[in-house]
Interface confidence: low
């Protein structure tokens, strides 16, 4: 009689909750951070002509006991974003990272001949949509 | 993605079998009785992140660009060995109303690992 029954999730390991009780959160909680980055900074400006810059998102923060509740449970059609992490695997610590399958491409205009001709391409897996303790 | 073979300590996929009985879920999952969930393990040295073939490659390349130059905020950002590809699995289970449901459940199996 909770979402967990009607939408089963995968347990990824045994040895439930191999952490000391009351382990404090080590860092700020896992969240997505935005940063404006120019292709010039990256040294890609000779290849990528437009846009000159883009909003880059990356995942940052720790995976302590409680993560803010703005991360929702998985429902069909939406990526799962876990809430209360406990490391279950021997020696494994959950890591704040982009959720698999949710990275998006960036559509760019490129040149390979110094600007005489242009192509429209996609830079795959550049934009982070969702972060989670994984 | 690499398979862990005991010879390498860089990020790889480790086989792991989960028994639903062992975690107390056999009262509502009818079949299967367990499955190979797998997990990711290993180190992520800076040259590994962003290697082509990884589904995180361009993203990791951008972060590494700044990380290797010691730029904030990326200087202290740790690269992690995480799932980069997951696979669904078909399951038979009881729902809230004790109805038997057969469903392909997303994200059940770790298929590939990579460095974030």
């Amino acid at each position: 009689s909770t979402p967990l029954m009607s939408w089963p999730w995968s347990p990824s390991a045994l040895r439930l909750l191999q952490r000391p009780p009351e382990e404090p959160a080590a860092h700020a909680n896992c969240h997505r951070v935005a940063l404006n980055i120019s292709f010039q900074e990256l040294g890609w400006e000779r290849w990528i002509v437009y846009p000159p810059s883009f909003i880059f998102h990356y995942c940052h923060g720790g995976c302590g006991l409680h993560i803010p509740p703005n991360l929702s449970l998985p429902v069909p059609g939406a990526p799962p974003t876990p809430a209360q992490p406990y490391s279950l695997l021997p020696g494994a610590q959950p890591c704040c990272a982009a959720l698999p399958g949710t990275m998006r491409p960036l559509h760019v205009r490129t040149t390979s001949d110094g600007g005489y001709s242009f192509k429209y391409e996609t830079v795959p897996n550049l934009l982070t949509q969702h972060c989670a303790c994984i | 993605g690499l398979e862990c073979d005991g010879k390498v300590n860089i990020c790889c996929k480790k086989q792991f079998f989960v028994s639903f009985k062992d975690i107390g879920w056999n009262d509502w999952i009818i079949a299967p009785s367990g499955y190979h969930a797998n997990y990711c393990e290993g180190e992520c040295p800076s040259h590994i992140a962003g290697t082509s073939g990884s589904s995180l490659s361009f993203h990791s390349t951008v972060i590494n660009h700044y990380r290797m130059r010691g730029h904030s905020p990326f200087a202290n950002l740790k690269s992690c060995c995480v799932p980069t590809k997951l696979r669904p699995m078909s399951m038979l289970y009881y729902d809230d109303g004790q109805n038997i449901i057969k469903k392909d459940i997303q994200n059940m199996i770790v298929e590939e690992c990579g460095c974030s």
Partner: antibody, heavy 126, light 108 residues
Framework: QVQLQESGPGLVKPSETLSLTCTVS????????WSWIRQPPGKGLEWIGY???????SFNPSLKSRVSMSVGTSKNQFSLKLSSVTAADTAVYYC????????????????????WGQGTMVTVSS | EIVLTQSPGTLSLSPGERATLSCRAS???????LAWYQQKPGQAPRLLIY???SRATGIPDRFSGSGSGTDFTLTISRLEPEDFAVYYC?????????FGQGTKVEIK
């Protein structure tokens, strides 16, 4: 059908320790957040804390310094101890289950309180 | 901690009428972590709604939940005599798990 039953003394003296036990019957004890919640007479509900069958705990910061929880040896009981009680601790004490799930990465998450005990009234008085 | 404020404190309605109960959070709560409970005198609370909008097993469809972020609503479409009780909202996404102070639905 999972059922919960609280047991323990109905009267505790001030400054003493309140001890209650919750017995779980008819279902699996593993993989859930076994919780204690209390309700002072005529007032609202207050979450005290939870324990997992492995012994991991989380408590309400307002009571943390006085609370301890443990799992019974038979693994179908969990208990609450609240030390240095005062009249303000007079309440109906409920045990409840918050069902849990595990995400694909081995992360346990809580659900709502789907099963409750009937509650036991504890009065703190000399 | 996340403080949940319920309004109104008391709702006086007649059987057959529609009841709308509000629960406001002091900070954003994922809708997946908000529940509603019904409590009658001398009884333990009973789970009505979990995940803000999903009905628990055996709960009649006149009960519905909605909302996201900081504002959540429990609606009882047509009040039955057995629905007069105290209703609590609760969040379980952030520790400490907290309850609202309750809304009493009484017969007018």
């Amino acid at each position: 059908q999972v059922q919960l039953q609280e047991s323990g003394p109905g009267l505790v003296k001030p400054s003493e320790t309140l001890s209650l036990t919750c017995t779980v019957s008819g279902g699996s004890f593993s993989s859930h957040f076994w919780s204690w919640i209390r309700q002072p007479p005529g007032k609202g509900l207050e979450w005290i804390g939870y324990i997992l069958y492995t012994g991991g705990t989380s408590f309400n910061p307002s009571l943390k310094s006085r609370v301890s929880m443990s799992v019974g040896t038979s693994k179908n009981q969990f208990s609450l101890k609240l030390s240095s009680v005062t009249a303000a601790d007079t309440a109906v004490y409920y045990c409840a289950r918050a069902r849990s799930g595990i995400t694909f990465t081995g992360i346990i998450v809580p659900g709502s309180f789907d099963i409750w005990g009937q509650g036991t009234m504890v009065t703190v008085s000399s | 901690e996340i403080v949940l404020t319920q309004s109104p404190g008391t709702l006086s309605l007649s059987p057959g009428e529609r009841a709308t109960l509000s629960c406001r959070a002091s900070q954003s709560v994922s809708s997946s972590y908000l529940a509603w409970y019904q409590q009658k005198p001398g009884q333990a609370p009973r789970l009505l709604i979990y995940g803000a909008s999903s009905r628990a097993t055996g709960i009649p469809d006149r009960f519905s939940g909605s909302g996201s972020g900081t504002d959540f609503t429990l609606t009882i479409s047509r009040l039955e005599p057995e629905d007069f009780a105290v209703y609590y909202c609760q969040q379980y996404g952030s520790s400490p798990w907290t309850f609202g102070q309750g809304t009493k639905v009484e017969i007018k």
